[in-house]
Interface confidence: low
């Protein structure tokens, strides 16, 4: 069988065998090697010589197989925009950023560019759990039966009502979505406002 041609090789149909790692150079009508992630083109290919690649300098990167003549500058995660760094820039990958705790991504342009404060969920509700933190603003849902949440907060979770009997106490007032059960000592009299409601 024919040995596989190695770049640079002629291509009449303007396509290359390995689209990820090769590119078509129209001036010479040849396929040349792309440079691997973390490198850039320091000398373009010709009919007799393949692409020459060089490593990206400190504080710059290229993420993909490329035929770029420069590396991209690393950019910071801007705290003014509500972003924080989760992984530093390397020669092969840009700085990885995410929204700071308590914030969500308000502006996307291929990646998050601007975070805003999550809105509070009122008492009796909690933020619906999302697959990915920081992806969207809070959607508040009511506490399920037997649970309560008594603050205005972007992150507070509904908690189960206290079971008075587990503590050797009796219920003085039932829990609501916004407040916990009130327990009392079995020997204590009921508060006056409750006394008329008890059937003996």
């Amino acid at each position: 069988s024919q040995p596989q041609a190695v770049p640079p090789y002629a291509s009449e149909n303007q396509t290359c065998r390995d689209q990820e790692k090769e590119y078509y150079e129209p001036q010479h009508r040849i396929c040349c090697s792309r440079c691997p992630p973390g490198t850039y083109v320091s000398a373009k290919c010709s009919r007799i010589r393949d692409t020459v690649c060089a490593t990206c300098a400190e504080n710059s990167y290229n993420e993909h197989w490329n035929y770029l003549t420069i590396c991209q500058l690393c950019r910071p995660c801007d705290p003014v925009m509500g972003l924080e760094e989760i992984a530093p820039c390397t020669s092969k990958r840009k700085t990885q950023c995410r929204c700071q705790p308590g914030m969500f991504c308000a502006a996307w342009a291929l990646e998050c560019t601007h975070c805003e404060l999550l809105s509070d969920c009122p008492p009796g509700t909690e933020a619906e759990l999302k697959d990915e933190v920081g992806k969207g603003n809070n959607h508040c849902v009511p506490c399920k039966a037997g649970h309560f949440q008594n603050t205005s907060s972007p992150s507070a979770r509904c908690q189960p009502h206290t079971r008075c009997e587990n503590q050797g106490l009796v219920e003085a007032a039932p829990g609501t979505a916004q407040s916990d059960t009130t327990c009392k000592n079995p020997l204590e009299p009921l508060p006056p406002e409750m006394s008329g409601t008890m059937l003996m």
Epitope: N59, S60, I70, L73, C74, R75, P76, D78, P79, V80, A107
Partner: antibody, heavy 120, light 106 residues
Framework: EVQLQQYGAELGKPGTSVKLSCKVS????????IHWVIQRPGKGLEWIGR????????ICTEKFKNKATLTADLSSNTAYMQLSQLKSDDTAIYFC?????????????WGQGTLVTVSS | DIQMTQSPSQLSASVGDRVTLSCKAS??????LNWYQQKLGEAPRLLIY???ILQTGIPSRFSGSGSGTDYTLTISSLQPEDAATYFC????????FGSGTKLEMK
């Protein structure tokens, strides 16, 4: 070649507004942010804010939030900054400068600046 | 807010001298720093970006270095046309310029 054209001087009375322009040639402002920088007489440089001309999104420093309004017109490739409620300490040179795809965080190109004089 | 302090505020040197200008950030700015030159009556001119990358068209006698909070602009052999004010500018957590160093010829 990227060039930025600003008018040399503007005169404003205290309490009024003035609108500065920054016309860009040789580069589509849709691929940039346009930034504005102030330099008071004999002083250093201070960043005011920037606009993304494609969507009109702006960011200004706290100090200039109620002072500067940034706009842009893609059809004329021009950015504008309106300064309101002029006071004597707004007397300064105002520069516009784009950040481009190749220089995303540095100002490689500058307008020549507009000198704003506030005087009654 | 991160403050940028330049020193000295003024400097007098002779043609051919090696000159070092300093810029100090109040906290780590992770090499996100640029240097500009401004002559009287002109707009600033970008010399160095990202701490040590020489802008196209700038003479190689200019160089930048530093990390963390401390950064330096060096002119290896001072020329008469280098008389100007030099500003550093950080772009980590917003854009802030230093107060400037005025460089004069002896």
């Amino acid at each position: 070649e990227v060039q930025l054209q600003q008018y040399g001087a503007e005169l404003g009375k205290p309490g009024t507004s003035v609108k500065l322009s920054c016309k860009v040639s040789g580069y589509n402002i849709g691929n940039t942010y346009i930034h504005w920088v102030i330099q008071r007489p004999g002083k250093g440089l201070e960043w005011i804010g920037r606009i993304d001309p494609t969507n009109g999104n702006t960011i200004c420093t706290e100090k200039f939030k109620n002072k500067a309004t940034l706009t842009a017109d893609l059809s004329s490739n021009t950015a504008y900054m309106q300064l309101s409620q002029l006071k004597s300490d707004d007397t300064a040179i105002y520069f516009c400068a784009p950040t481009t795809l190749t220089t995303p965080d540095s100002f490689a190109y500058w307008g020549q600046g507009t000198l704003v004089t506030v005087s009654s | 807010d991160i403050q940028m302090t330049q020193s000295p505020s003024q400097l007098s040197a002779s043609v051919g001298d090696r000159v070092t200008l300093s810029c100090k950030a109040s906290q780590n700015i992770y090499k996100y720093l640029n240097w500009y030159q401004q002559k009287l009556g002109e707009a600033p001119r970008l010399l160095i970006y990202s701490t040590n990358i020489l802008q196209t068209g700038i003479p190689s006698r200019f160089s930048g270095s530093g990390s963390g909070t401390d950064y330096t602009l060096t002119i290896s052999s001072l020329q008469p046309e280098d008389a100007a004010t030099y500003f550093c500018q950080k772009y980590y957590s917003g854009f802030t310029f230093g107060s400037g160093t005025k460089l004069e010829m002896k």
